[in-house]
Each structure stands twice: as structure tokens, then as C-alpha cells.
Amino acid sequence: TTELTEEKYEYKEGQTLEVKCDYALEKYANSRKAWQKMEGKMPKILAKTERPSENSHPVQVGRITLEDYPDHGLLQVRMTNLQVEDSGLYQCVIYQHPKESHVLFNPICLVVTKGSSGTPGSSENSTQNVYRTPSTTAKALGPRYTSPRTVTQAPPESTVVVSTPGSEINLTNVTDIIRVPVFN
């Protein structure tokens, strides 16, 4: 088994966490993906994609947006307007059933602290060089989401996943499992 190594990421309140989660294209392109937070030893599903996964059709749950790119083998997660209480351990997973999920390596240990200065969302963690192109030709800084699918917050689901390093389930080949990148 491969040991899960947590990666610590520090943000200020109001900033946006962007995560790029790679996955094996041939195996998981049509699978549902989910973003979950560990609460104790039980993961809580915060958002999950539709099935079959639609290319670049955002799924939005509150401040969380999931955008799956099955043509590219990549799931993008955005958590906007981060708050101190968002701090915790997060994972991208291939969501197959509430009791069975393929877990990412390198879970994200998110630490959100009170911002001391600057406007919310503006910092070294902000996305650079991005132009937002609405229906007009005007361009402004910052990403934009087109026609997000808003999902009413449902009662949290849980996946039974052992979070102890080295004891993850369904690891048949490490190249099949997506890895956690954090885009900051």
C-alpha cells in the first residue's frame, strides 16, 4: 500500500482554494467524483459531480464548485470565500457508492486564518494571469463560471474510508488513483 501524505496549505479568510485532481482517464472518465472533508474518521461528502460526468458543466454547492474534465482526466475544485471554520482535511475521491470510494493521495490539510490586511481573495494564493471573458468583449481579472448547476445542499453523505495512512481501500494500481494537486 502507498502511504497517504497530508499536504498543508495555508490561506487567509476570503481567499479561494483551487485544487486540480488528476485521475486515470480510461478508468475514471465516466465516474462520479466528489470532494469530501474528514470529520473525525468519517468523511463527509460536500459536493459530487453528476453521472455521467458532463464535460466542464460546473456543479455548485454553496461556496464549492466542482468542474470535471473527462477529456483531460482532471477534476477542478474551487472553494471560495474561505472561512476559518473551513480548516480541516479534504480529499478528492472517485465516488462510486457511499460505502466505496477511491481515495486520492496527498489529502489537503487546509488551514484558514484571519486576514490581517488586503481585500478578501487578493494574495499570493490568488490565481494570476486569468482573464474573465463574459458575453461581451470586455475582459476583467478573475475566473468566471458559466451556467453553473446549482445543487441544493442535501444532508451530508458519508463514505466509509479508512483514513489511516497506508490503509486506503481499492488500491489495485497506484497509477489508477488520482492525486491531489492544490492550485494556488
Epitope: D22, N55, Y69, D71, H72, Q128, N129, P143, V174, P181
Partner: antibody, heavy 116, light 107 residues
């Protein structure tokens, strides 16, 4: 089979302009991020620009920001790179690439030579 | 920007031997790392993404590993078609950046 065919390369004087085009086939163009990557003669690879499917996100490397413009026409399965205020250091083979973060499929490239 | 450094610049290996290439990032890129192969006069080809996931059609003798700032690319038994230049690339942060390349040549 994915095919990306670049056109529009050639010789241009410093300060001049050139528009590269890329004809895409063999995949759902409108579902894919696209990028331009260049390679100066005898040198390594340099990313230039990336564009989301619907054009809502566009990223540039600092060295071409304000001079180069990436655009796409999903109805025609085409990607473009408008290059203005060209400099000698822009001389390179320009590749049209499927993908926005990593580069999954490449065209054969279009040579752009900036010289007086 | 994140600077990617590859080593060695040139690697001389005999056919059938193992080739191990290194890539180091100036700051953590998690596992947002890809490897490409470029043969002389040809366009590059994606081999590995997500640090260890093989792209479509890439043989099992090719593998990648690492996370954070240190990455390794391995060809377990070099074939004639493997002699080429290899590049690593990070896609955690904009701008996307690539290493300077490692040339794998016949010993």
C-alpha cells in the same frame, strides 16, 4: 485520431504581426481546453497561452501578455494566436496543443521567424 | 513563477538498461507534474501526468513517481525508440513552466 494542424507561420519583420491558426479534428473541440506552446530553435519548450472551452478563462505567460491574443471558434473547430509587436526572441516553432494545464496532443508546429 | 530543474542534462545509457531522470520544482507542485518525450524533428508527446499516471498508449516500462518538489521518471529497459529528449512540466500554478530537458542518448 486527434489531429491538430497549424498554419499561418512565416517570416515577419520585428514589430510586425502574424496570426496563427490551428484546425482541430478527431475529438470534441468544444469540450477541450486548448493551448499554444513554442520552442525556439535548439531550445526547450515554453508555454504561451491557454484557453478554456467557452473562452471564460484565458491565461498568458508574462512575456507575451498584451502582445499575443489566444482565441477560438468552436463552430469551426479552430484555435488562433494573434501575435503583435513581434520581436526576434519570438522566433520559434509554435505548437497548437489540446489541453490547458498539461498538453495531451500536439500539432506538428508552425515556424515563425522574426527577422529584418 | 515555479522554476523546474531537470538533471542530468544528458544521460548516456545502453539499450536494455534502466534510465532514471530527475525533476525538481522550486516550490511544491503537489503531484501536478507531467513528463513529455520529444524525438528529433517531431512534436512532443505526453507520457505521464499526475506525477505517476501513464497517458493513453504509454507502455508499462515507463513510470513516474514523486510529489511536492522531487520527481523521478524511469524507463525500466531502454528501447531504441526511447532515445529522445524528456521534459517535465508543472501545472499547479500559472504560468505553466517546463524544465530544460534531459537528453537520453545511446551509450
Amino acid at each position: 485520431e486527434v489531429q491538430l494542424v497549424e498554419s499561418g507561420g512565416g517570416l515577419v519583420q520585428p514589430g510586425g504581426s502574424l496570426r496563427l491558426s490551428c484546425a482541430a479534428s478527431g475529438f470534441t473541440f468544444s469540450s477541450n481546453w486548448m493551448s499554444w506552446v513554442r520552442q525556439a530553435p535548439g531550445k526547450g519548450l515554453d508555454w504561451m497561452a491557454s484557453m478554456k472551452q467557452d473562452g471564460s478563462e484565458i491565461y498568458y505567460v508574462d512575456s507575451v501578455k498584451g502582445r499575443f491574443t489566444i482565441s477560438r471558434d468552436n463552430a469551426k473547430n479552430s484555435l488562433h494566436l494573434q501575435m503583435n509587436s513581434l520581436r526576434a526572441e519570438d522566433t520559434a516553432v509554435y505548437y497548437c496543443v489540446r489541453g490547458g494545464w498539461r498538453f495531451e496532443s500536439w500539432g506538428q508546429g508552425a515556424l515563425v521567424t522574426v527577422s529584418s | 513563477e515555479i522554476v523546474m530543474t531537470q538533471s542530468p542534462a544528458t544521460l548516456s545509457v545502453s539499450p536494455g538498461e534502466r534510465a532514471t531522470l530527475s525533476c525538481r520544482a522550486s516550490q511544491s507542485v503537489s503531484s501536478n507534474l507531467a513528463w513529455y518525450q520529444q524525438k528529433s524533428g517531431q512534436a512532443p508527446r505526453l507520457l505521464i501526468y499526475g506525477a505517476s499516471i501513464r497517458a493513453t498508449g504509454i507502455p508499462a516500462r515507463v513510470s513516474g513517481s514523486g510529489s511536492g518538489t522531487e520527481f523521478t521518471f524511469t524507463i525500466s529497459s531502454l528501447q531504441s525508440e526511447d532515445f529522445a529528449v524528456y521534459y517535465c512540466q508543472q501545472y499547479k500554478n500559472w504560468p505553466l513552466t517546463l524544465g530544460g530537458g534531459t537528453k537520453v542518448e545511446i551509450k
